[in-house]
Amino acid sequence: GGGGAAPTETQPPVTNLSVSVENLCTVIWTWNPPEGASPNCSLWYFSHFGDKQDKKLAPETRRSKEVPLNEKICLQVGSQCSTNESEKPSILVEKCISPPEGDPESAVTELQCIWHNLSYMQCSWLPGRNTSPDTNYTLYYWHRSLEKIRQCEEIYKEGQYFGCSFDLTKVKDSSFEQHSVQIMVKDYAGKIKPSFNIVPLTSRVKPDPPHIKNLSFHNGDLHVQWENPQNFISRCLFYEVEVNNSQTETHNVFSVQEAKCQNPEFERNVENTSCFMVPGVLPDTLNTVRIRVKTNKLCYEDDKLWSNWSQEMSIGKKRNST
């Protein structure tokens, strides 16, 4: 229950509903209690966004939402005397915030970012349709671990795309990845409409390639041992091992279900290493191995980004053709 008796009449509307933006994309609405509310009313506030999404009933006179300000967003707020969701709230008061001014055709498009090896973020975008070729872009970013909004220093161009990279290193704090990075791209001259993006740190993570440490043959199996990219714990990764055989010209890719170094043939207790046995490999032929990794869906929501392939390592002899 939510406290005092709930009078049947509807409460007056909230007052002084206002909206502001913190950081780059944190929109904050605040309001005051209604004037002339029933004295025996324990006030609760019902709020939802314009599309009736994210309904909330809470005693606080504030609500925030992390949202890319590429379009208008509105919050409606009403008051009521209990936590009973079926109680009709007061008349709803609405306050909206619009994106910054500018020609929508001038805003950059396809603004996206990849978090490389949990150590730096690389963002890229395409110019808007109504922009001059000499537009000087600038990218701003903010994350909860930063005290203030930062500007990305080195803007580069690669084909049609512009881009910029900035350091963002995962810290041991367990909540680090629960927060997103807020991004804004605009131009120095202020001629284009700014574009915003919010990048959850549980998505778009691309590990560095692993490093093969050792290949050896044992009882008709090829034993592969590799070092995982730094910054990742083994529970958050999985692997593909590719083996090319020069004689049979076969090209096999193994989805590694287990990558534990439990066999005596493997170097044991080496930090951050993984192992796999490839069955039925001919030792008297040349076998070339490479490995790639990607993040596990239990740790990171987006699992589409494989690392690049590792450097190749070979074992065995290339047979002379007779």
């Epitope: 083994s234 529970r235 999985f238 989805s255 590694v256 279900q257 287990e258 534990k260 439990q262 239990l298």
Partner: antibody, heavy 118, light 104 residues
Framework: EVQLVQSGAEVKKPGESLKISCKGS????????IGWVRQMPGKGLEWMGV????????RYSPSFQGQVTISADKSISTAYLQWSSLKASDTAMYYC???????????WGQGTLVTVSS | EIVLTQSPGTLSLSPGERATLSCRAS???????LAWYQQKPGQAPRLLIY???SRATGIPDRFSGSGSGTDFTLTISRLEPEDFAVYYC?????FGQGTKVEIK
């Protein structure tokens, strides 16, 4: 040989608490996720959640978040599933299973039947 | 949330016949995650296929998996008497509702 051995069947009353167990052997218990799967009478399989005993990191299905608690004691290679207040609708067979990073349950326990009835 | 829909609900076949079971995802998924299980009455499920097409340890080669994107298939090339059971597909946190393969 990889084995997961679960605790025995339980009969409980609504509102009671319960903790069932799953003991792993024959592999490095701290290097694999362990998951729990529910199967209500005559129904299909439901993914409840997983734990990584190495660091006790847990992940729950939204349907089971807040309804159950998954824990592990790596010193005795045992994972647990617990309820603080059982409901009749918790009556089901509960399976624990090993869950490699690749995302499939490769070895299963024999199941623990939980019956909740007044 | 991804939904996996299996079809048909029941498949009535004779031993020696070929069984084709379908699993359709509500949105495209990585084939890396698609697994198939067999469950017989009173028993725990058993992993047959992981990564959409890789056979689990000890699974006979009459079982094969294929597919990508949203459509995945489990094929049993020649049904043996012990293959009559319920089959589930799974993708991380989601199981399909199951297909029962019964003797005709």
């Amino acid at each position: 040989e990889v084995q997961l051995v679960q605790s025995g069947a339980e009969v409980k009353k609504p509102g009671e608490s319960l903790k069932i167990s799953c003991k792993g052997s024959g592999y490095s218990f701290t290097s694999y996720w362990i998951g729990w799967v529910r199967q209500m009478p005559g129904k299909g399989l439901e993914w409840m959640g997983v734990i990584y005993p190495g660091d006790s990191y847990t992940r729950y299905s939204p349907s089971f978040q807040g309804q159950v608690t998954i824990s592990a004691d790596k010193s005795i290679s045992t994972a647990y599933l617990q309820w603080s207040s059982l409901k009749a609708s918790d009556t089901a067979m509960y399976y624990c299973a090993r869950f490699p990073n690749w995302g499939s349950f490769d070895y299963w326990g024999q199941g623990t039947l939980v019956t909740v009835s007044s | 949330e991804i939904v996996l829909t299996q079809s048909p609900g029941t498949l009535s076949l004779s031993p020696g016949e070929r069984a084709t079971l379908s699993c359709r995802a509500s949105q495209s998924i990585s084939s890396s995650y698609l697994a198939w299980y067999q469950q017989k009455p009173g028993q725990a499920p058993r992993l047959l296929i992981y990564g959409a097409s890789s056979r689990a340890t000890g699974i006979p080669d009459r079982f094969s998996g294929s597919g990508s994107g949203t459509d995945f298939t489990l094929t049993i090339s020649r049904l043996e008497p012990e293959d009559f059971a319920v089959y589930y597909c799974q993708q991380y946190e989601t199981f399909g509702q199951g297909t029962k393969v019964e003797i005709k």
